[in-house]
Each structure stands twice: as structure tokens, then as C-alpha cells.
């Protein structure tokens, strides 16, 4: 198959990032270098910029069976796989002549599963083997969330207004998870 | 339920087009993303690609990148599968199918017919 997948200890199963679609090309709707407006030069403040599609995730879809072992779902599923910049890029040149880059240091805006839904897969299996039924984790939606360095790597903050509406149906999730598990999730998602 | 018709199957020759058709009636807002699959005779249904509705961004199986096209008719609600430069390989049952995104193709047409011969 196309799509190798690999189980974590949340027995989710995660596509290999090696396989994600290609993203389609960039939007060319960015003001933030336009002469007319800007001089060529992006504006002081990065963040303060009326084009909200520099702000927006990029929600690319796919298709896949899931599968487990010589074991694959009887029916495909769908997800998403979140893409796109969060914000202008901010990168700065390192030193004169070197040609590196930094980010400097302040919050850092990425583009991360926001949304999950829980499917019951059942899973058919070679050589008359009895159908199992696996629970499985499917990205619903993307979400631009800010991960803010001066705090714990596991405090992801919304972008946006939506940031104070609670979600339905949602319980609140515990916070005792740690920035090492955590930071797995993230490097997952993108 | 969304109720899906598949048509334009048929036989081709090798390096020959064809284009299949999908089209959903019912409770068609309830599906985000439709797809087309197909099954070779003895082999597993596989995944061709899908179109999420919304904005119309596709994804593509490796096995027909660059020779297959997807697109949707909102007004019509229907789906398209272009097939160019067809090979034997491609011949098969084609599906096309109905999900919400996160969740499983649940929603089957009955198949369309497409045999590609040397």
C-alpha cells in the first residue's frame, strides 16, 4: 500500500510524513510586499496586517485504508493533514555573509490539528482470521494555534477569537501531560 | 443517506481516455469529501483519489498521478474522473463513494465497468 502506517502509544495511526500530498501552489494574494503599500519592505508589525489568508491553515485532505499488520479496514477513511504558514514567515538573516536564518524570539505560530473525530474501523484479516474492530483518530479540522517560548512547550494558544469560546461537547482535557509527550504530538502533525 | 451513480464506463484501448461520472442525490450535505476507488478482478479495492467539495482540493493514489483528473459540478453535484493515457493495469470495477472528513467512506455507488486492453 501507498500509505505505511505506524501505531504511537495512543494507538493512533499516523500516516508517514514522507507520504502527505503536495500542497497546491502558494496563494498570491499576499499584501504585505506590495510596493504600492509597503515600499517592498514587510510592515513593522507582523502580525498587524488586514489579510486574513496569511493567517489561515491550509486543510489538505487524503484518503487511506487503515491498516494494521496484513489487517486493513473494510471501508477507506478521510483526514487532514494541516499545511500552510501561520503569519509572515519573520525570518531574519543570522550574520552578514553567512546565509543562516533564525526566527526570533517571541510567539511562534503553527498550523496543527485542531479538531479530531474518533472512527471505529473493523479491520479484515488474511487467512480466515475473525474481523477486529479498532478505534482510530482522524483529524477533522486545522487551527493556526501560537506556541508562546517563555511558557511549558505544552501550552498551545488558540489564534484568533476563538480562542475564548468553549467547545461543545468537549470535556476539558488535564493538563498534567508533559512537554516531551507533547512535542511528540506536534512534530506529528506537522 | 447519499445515493451515488457511477456512468461512463467501458472499453478502452491502452494509452486511450475515458471519463467516469459520479452523480450523489440525497442528503448530499452531509459529505465533505468524495472519492473514486476501483477493484481489479482477485484484488483489494484500492483507493484512486478524492476530492473535498469545499474547495476542490484533490488527492491522488501514486498508481495515477499526472494521468488522472478529479473534479466536481457543484450545480450538478457530480464528480468526475478524467483517465488519460489508460493502461491494462487500470482496468477494474469503479467505485465512487461519500464520507465526512474524519470519518469513513460510507456512502458506495454500485460500480462502473472499465477494461483497458493491450
Known amino acids: 500500500q501507498g500509505w505505511q502506517a505506524f501505531k504511537n502509544d495512543a494507538t493512533e495511526i499516523i500516516p508517514e510524513l514522507g507520504e502527505y500530498p503536495e500542497p497546491p501552489p502558494e496563494l498570491e494574494n499576499n499584501k504585505t510586499m506590495n510596493r504600492a503599500e509597503n515600499g517592498g519592505r514587510p510592515p513593522h508589525h507582523p502580525f498587524e496586517t488586514k489579510d486574513v489568508s496569511e493567517y489561515s491553515c491550509r486543510e489538505l485532505h487524503f484518503t487511506r485504508y487503515v491498516t494494521d499488520g496484513p489487517c486493513r479496514s473494510a471501508k477507506p477513511v478521510t483526514e487532514l493533514v494541516c499545511s500552510g504558514q501561520c503569519g509572515p514567515a519573520r525570518l531574519l538573516p543570522n550574520a552578514i555573509g553567512r546565509g543562516k536564518w533564525w526566527r526570533p524570539s517571541g510567539p511562534d505560530f503553527r498550523c496543527i490539528p485542531d479538531r479530531y473525530r474518533a472512527q471505529r474501523v473493523q479491520l479484515l484479516c488474511p487467512g480466515g482470521e475473525a474481523p477486529r474492530a479498532r478505534k482510530v483518530r482522524l483529524v477533522a479540522s486545522c487551527k493556526c494555534k501560537r506556541l508562546t517560548r517563555f511558557h511549558n512547550q505544552s501550552e498551545l494558544k488558540d489564534f484568533g477569537t476563538e480562542a475564548a469560546r468553549p467547545q461543545k461537547g468537549r470535556k476539558p482535557r488535564p493538563r498534567a501531560r508533559s512537554a516531551k509527550a507533547n512535542q511528540a504530538e506536534l512534530e506529528n502533525a506537522y | 443517506e447519499v445515493q451515488l451513480v457511477e456512468s461512463g464506463g467501458g472499453l478502452v484501448q491502452a494509452g486511450g481516455s475515458l471519463r467516469l461520472s459520479c452523480a450523489a442525490s440525497?442528503?448530499?450535505?452531509?459529505?465533505?469529501?468524495m472519492g473514486w476507488f476501483r477493484q481489479a478482478p482477485g484484488k483489494v479495492r484500492e483507493e484512486v483519489g478524492s476530492i473535498k467539495w469545499s474547495d476542490a482540493n484533490t488527492y491522488y493514489a501514486d498508481s495515477v498521478k499526472g494521468r488522472f483528473t478529479i473534479s466536481r459540478d457543484n450545480a450538478k453535484n457530480t464528480m468526475y474522473l478524467q483517465m488519460n493515457s489508460l493502461k491494462p493495469e487500470d482496468t477494474g470495477v469503479y467505485y465512487c463513494?461519500?464520507?465526512?472528513?474524519?470519518?469513513?467512506?460510507?456512502?458506495w455507488g454500485q460500480g462502473t465497468q472499465v477494461t483497458v486492453s493491450s
Open positions: 440525497g442528503r448530499t450535505f452531509s459529505r465533505d469529501v
Open positions: 463513494a461519500a464520507a465526512i472528513i474524519g470519518g469513513t467512506y460510507n456512502d
